[in-house]
Interface confidence: low
C-alpha cells in the first residue's frame, strides 16, 4: 500500500520567471507519517540530492513543509522531498523539476515582403532569449475577412510565410503574437498595400551590342520580369572594366521608367566592359530585385589618342660623313593605343626636302644619316587610323647641347625611385628620363621614358631592384634638338654592402703604419658608401676604431707600439648598416730605419 | 560578475596547519542558492573535493577529511576559509575554492587556485 | 561512496573530429552528473549539469548524454581550443562530492 508516494509537492509542474522567487511546498500523507513514525520536521529537501540548508525550510504544519528560493538563476532545477526515517535512512517522498526562463517580448521590426511569384513572407525580431518554448503565430486580416494564422517553424521562429495567394491594391493588416508558459504578447500592427512590399525578378536576356560608328557606347537590351504587367519599374545599371573590381553606375534618373534597352555613353574604346541590371516599382516602394545575370560587351576601336614616347641614340663610330641613328619608341597602354595596333610609320625630312618613309612592325628603327640636320615623325595605326605624330629632331653633327636642367635629385618613396628638377628657363617640349644598373661585372643597359614638357617631377616606370645603382640621366628636348643631359646615382632601398674592405700596408715604420686599400666595386656597395672604420688592436690590448671619411683609400695608423703584431680590419656603412672586411696582421719594426740597438 | 580569489601561504611544515582564505567580490556570500567550497588537486592529478559551506555556517565534508578540515565563514568580510591541520607530503595540492550552485547542483565559478607545499 | 570511472584516461583527435568521452557511475546516480573542462595551469571550467543542461556561455558543440549509471560528452567538431583534461562529477549522493580520473584530450 506504500508503493502511491508517501505525499506530494505543490506546485506540480512549475515553470517560473528567471531571477524570481519561487516557494514549494510539501505536503506528507497521514499513512506514511503513521508507518514511519515521521511528520514535517523530518523533511529533507535537496536540489540535485544536494541537502538544501534547514533555514530555507518553513514548517507549516505537522503535515507540511515548504522551500523557498531567491533569485533562481538555473534553466531546470531537480528539486525532491525526502523524510528521515529509522536509523537516519533517507526515503523519498516526491520529486519535481522547476522550469524558469522569461515571458516572451513583444516583437519588433515587423516587415514583410512578396517575391514575384510567391507568396508574402513576414519576419521579425524576437528580442531576447526566454529559455521556454515560445510560439511565434502571424496574424493577418483584410477590414472584411480574417486569415488563417501562420504559425512560425521551431527552427525558423523569427519568420513565416503565408499560406494565401497575395491581392494586390487591397490594404491588409499584419502582426505577430509570441506566447509562452509565463505570457502572451503582440507587436505592432502594420497595415499596407501588398503592391508595396514587392521585389520583381532581375530582368533577363541581358545583352550588349557595340557600335561601330561610336567607340565610347555599348547598347544593352534586356526582358522585364512579369511583374511589369502590375507595376512600373525603374532600373539600376552597373558596369566595369573586365579587369576591375569596382562597379560604376549609371545616373538613377536616366533609368528611372519602365523600359527594355538603354544606350551606355562615355566609355573608353577597345574595352570589354561587364554589365549587369536589377529592378524595382518605380515609385521607389518595395524592393530592389536580386541582380540579373552579368553581360560582357567590347567597344568599338578608335584612333590612338595619343603619339608614342619617341627617342633615338646615335652610334658613336661612324663612317666618314654618316652616322648610324638607333631611332626607339614605346608601345601604347590600352587606353592610348584603342584597338591593336598593326602598324609604325616613321618620315625622316632632312632639311625642307623629303627623304624617306618607313612603314614598322618593330618598336625600333636603325638608319644612317648623314652629318645634317634631320626631323623624324613617328605614327601608330590601328584599324581605325592613325595616332597624332610624334616629332623629333636629330640635330646636325656639330650640334652644341646646352641648357640642362638643374638640380637634380633622385630619391626613394613609396616603394618607388623619384627624380626631380628645376626647369630650365627655355621652353622644353619634353624630357628623355634614361636608367640603367651600374655594374663592373655588365655593361649599362639604359631603359628610358617620356615626360611632358610641363613635368619637373616623376618616378622611374620600370621593375627596379634594391640594392642597386641606378645610374638616372634626364635630358631635356627643346624644338631645335636635346639639352645637355645630366646625371644622378641612386638607389631604390640600400642594404649593409656584401663585402667589406680589404686593408693592407702601404709602409710600415717603428711607430706609425699607412694602411690602403681599394674602393669597394659597385656590385658589393649595396648603397652609398658614406664612411669607414678602421679597428686595430694588439694580441693583449684593447681594440680601437678610427673613423674615416668615404672619399679616402688611405690613412696613417700613428703612435703605435715598436716590435708589436697589430690586427687591422676594416668596415664599410651605407645608410643601412656596415660589413666588415678580413683581418689583417703587421708587426712592426724594432727600430726605425737607420736606428742602431 | 562574481569573482573567487584564493590567499594564504604557499609553503607549509609537516605536521602544521594549512590556512587559507577565498575572497568572493560581485556578489554576496550570504545568497541563498549558492554553498561555497573547497577542491583539491595535487601535482598532476585529479580533483578532490575537500568541502562545502552554507552562507549561515551550515558545513560538509569529505568523509576521508572529516577529522582534519575546518571550513568557516567571515559574512561580514565576505569571505570563507579552510583550515586542514596535521599536513604531510600528500596534502601538497593546487587549492580551489568554488561556488556551489544549489540550482544547477555543479561548481559554477571557480578561483585560479593556489599552490601549496608541504615539506620542512 | 559513489566511485566514477573515465574511458578512456586519453585520447588524440585532429582538429573538426567528433571526440566522445564516457563516465560510469559505480551505483545509479538517475541524472545527477556534471562535466568539467580543465586547462593547464587554469581552473576547471563547468561545461554540462544535470547529464545534459549546456552551461551559460559554453559553446553549442558540447553535449551531454545519459542516465543512470553510464554518461558521455560529446564534441562534435573538435575545434583547437578544446584541447584539455575533461572530468565528470556526480552530485546524487552527497556528501562526498566524488569526480572521474580524468580525460586527458591531445591533439593528434
Known amino acids: 500500500e506504500l508503493l502511491d508516494p508517501c505525499g506530494y509537492i505543490s506546485p506540480e509542474s512549475p515553470v517560473v520567471q528567471l531571477h524570481s522567487n519561487f516557494t514549494a511546498v510539501c505536503v506528507l500523507k497521514e499513512k506514511c507519517m503513521d508507518y514511519f513514525h515521521v511528520n514535517a520536521n523530518y523533511i529533507v529537501w535537496k536540489t540535485n540530492h544536494f541537502t538544501i540548508p534547514k533555514e530555507q525550510y518553513t514548517i507549516i504544519n505537522r503535515t507540511a513543509s515548504s522551500v523557498t528560493f531567491t533569485d533562481i538563476s538555473s534553466l531546470n532545477i531537480q528539486l525532491t522531498c525526502n523524510i528521515l526515517t529509522f536509523g537516519q535512512l533517507e526515503q523519498n517522498v516526491y520529486g519535481i523539476t522547476i522550469i524558469s526562463g522569461l515571458p516572451p517580448e513583444k516583437p519588433k521590426n515587423l516587415s514583410c515582403i512578396v517575391n514575384e511569384g510567391k507568396k508574402m513572407r513576414c519576419e521579425w525580431n524576437r528580442g531576447r532569449e526566454t529559455h521556454l518554448e515560445t510560439n511565434f503565430t502571424l496574424k493577418s486580416e483584410w477590414a472584411t475577412h480574417k486569415f488563417a494564422d501562420c504559425k512560425a517553424k521551431r527552427d525558423t521562429p523569427t519568420s513565416c510565410t503565408v499560406d494565401y495567394s497575395t491581392v494586390y491594391f487591397v490594404n491588409i493588416e499584419v502582426w505577430v503574437e509570441a506566447e509562452n508558459a509565463l505570457g502572451k504578447v503582440t507587436s505592432d500592427h502594420i497595415n499596407f498595400d501588398p503592391v508595396y512590399k514587392v521585389k520583381p525578378n532581375p530582368p533577363h536576356n541581358l545583352s550588349v551590342i557595340n557600335s561601330e560608328e561610336l567607340s565610347s557606347i555599348l547598347k544593352l537590351t534586356w526582358t522585364n520580369p512579369s511583374i511589369k504587367s502590375v507595376i512600373r519599374l525603374k532600373y539600376n545599371i552597373q558596369y566595369r572594366t573586365k579587369d576591375a573590381s569596382t562597379w560604376s553606375q549609371i545616373p538613377p534618373e536616366d533609368t528611372a521608367s519602365t523600359r527594355s534597352s538603354f544606350t551606355v555613353q562615355d566609355l573608353k574604346p577597345f574595352t570589354e566592359y561587364v554589365f549587369r541590371i536589377c529592378c524595382m516599382k518605380e515609385d521607389g516602394k518595395g524592393y530592389w530585385s536580386d541582380w540579373s545575370e552579368e553581360a560582357n560587351g567590347i567597344t568599338y576601336e578608335d584612333r590612338p589618342s595619343k603619339a608614342p614616347s619617341f627617342w633615338y641614340k646615335i652610334d658613336p663610330s661612324h663612317a666618314q660623313g654618316y652616322r648610324t641613328v638607333q631611332l626607339m619608341w614605346k608601345t601604347l597602354p590600352p587606353f592610348e593605343a584603342n584597338g591593336k595596333i598593326l602598324d609604325y610609320e616613321v618620315t625622316l625630312t632632312r632639311w625642307k626636302s623629303h627623304l624617306q618613309n618607313y612603314t614598322v612592325n618593330d618598336t625600333k628603327l636603325t638608319v644612317n644619316l648623314t652629318n645634317d640636320r634631320y626631323v623624324a615623325t613617328l605614327t601608330a595605326r590601328n584599324l581605325v587610323g592613325k595616332s597624332d605624330a610624334a616629332v623629333l629632331t636629330i640635330p646636325a653633327c656639330d650640334f652644341q647641347a646646352t641648357h640642362p636642367v638643374m638640380d637634380l635629385k633622385a630619391f626613394p618613396k613609396d616603394n618607388m625611385l623619384w627624380v626631380e628638377w628645376t626647369t630650365p628657363r627655355e621652353s622644353v617640349k619634353k624630357y628623355i628620363l634614361e636608367w640603367c644598373v651600374l655594374s663592373d661585372k655588365a655593361p649599362c643597359i639604359a631603359d628610358w621614358q617620356q615626360e611632358d614638357g610641363t613635368v619637373h617631377r616623376t618616378h622611374l616606370r620600370g621593375n627596379l631592384a634594391e640594392s642597386k645603382c641606378y645610374l638616372i640621366t634626364v635630358t631635356p628636348v627643346y624644338a631645335d634638338g636635346p639639352g645637355s643631359p645630366e646625371s644622378i646615382k641612386a638607389y631604390l632601398k640600400q642594404a649593409p654592402p656584401s663585402k667589406g674592405p680589404t686593408v693592407r700596408t702601404k709602409k710600415v715604420g717603428k711607430n706609425e703604419a699607412v694602411l690602403e686599400w681599394d674602393q669597394l666595386p659597385v656590385d658589393v656597395q649595396n648603397g652609398f658608401i658614406r664612411n669607414y672604420t678602421i679597428f686595430y688592436r694588439t694580441i693583449i690590448g684593447n681594440e680601437t676604431a678610427v673613423n674615416v671619411d668615404s672619399s679616402h683609400t688611405e690613412y696613417t695608423l700613428s703612435s703605435l707600439t715598436s716590435d708589436t703584431l697589430y690586427m687591422v680590419r676594416m668596415a664599410a656603412y651605407t645608410d643601412e648598416g656596415g660589413k666588415d672586411g678580413p683581418e689583417f696582421t703587421f708587426t712592426t719594426p724594432k727600430f726605425a730605419q737607420g736606428e742602431i740597438e | 560578475q562574481l569573482q573567487l580569489q584564493e590567499s594564504g601561504p604557499g609553503l607549509v611544515k609537516p605536521s602544521e596547519t594549512l590556512s587559507l582564505i577565498c575572497t568572493v567580490s560581485?556578489?554576496?556570500?550570504?545568497?541563498?542558492?549558492?554553498?561555497w567550497g573547497w577542491i583539491r588537486q595535487p601535482p598532476g592529478k585529479g580533483l578532490e573535493w575537500i568541502g562545502n559551506?552554507?552562507?549561515?555556517?551550515?558545513?560538509y565534508y569529505n568523509p576521508s577529511l572529516k577529522s582534519r578540515v575546518t571550513i568557516s565563514v567571515d559574512t561580514s568580510k565576505n569571505q570563507f576559509s579552510l583550515k586542514l591541520s596535521f599536513v604531510t607530503a600528500a596534502d601538497t595540492a593546487v587549492y580551489h575554492c568554488a561556488r556551489w550552485d544549489t540550482n544547477g547542483g555543479a561548481f559554477d565559478i571557480w578561483g585560479q587556485g593556489t599552490m601549496v607545499t608541504v615539506s620542512s | 561512496d559513489i566511485q566514477m570511472t573515465q574511458s578512456p584516461s586519453s585520447l588524440s583527435a585532429s582538429v573538426g573530429d567528433r571526440v566522445t568521452i564516457t563516465c560510469r557511475a559505480s551505483q545509479s546516480i538517475s541524472s545527477y552528473l556534471n562535466w568539467y573542462q580543465q586547462k593547464p595551469g587554469k581552473a576547471p571550467k563547468l561545461l554540462i549539469y544535470?547529464?545534459?543542461s549546456l552551461q551559460s556561455g559554453v559553446p553549442s558543440r558540447f553535449s551531454g548524454s545519459g542516465s543512470g549509471t553510464d554518461f558521455t560528452l560529446t564534441i562534435s567538431s573538435l575545434q583547437p581550443e578544446d584541447f584539455a583534461t575533461y572530468y565528470c562529477?556526480?552530485?546524487?549522493?552527497?556528501?562526498?562530492?566524488?569526480f572521474g580520473q580524468g580525460t586527458r584530450l591531445e591533439i593528434k
Open positions: 560581485g556578489g554576496s556570500i550570504s545568497s541563498n542558492n549558492y554553498y
Open positions: 562529477q556526480q552530485s546524487y549522493s552527497t556528501p562526498p562530492i566524488t
Open positions: 559551506l552554507y552562507g549561515s555556517g551550515s558545513t
Open positions: 544535470a547529464a545534459s
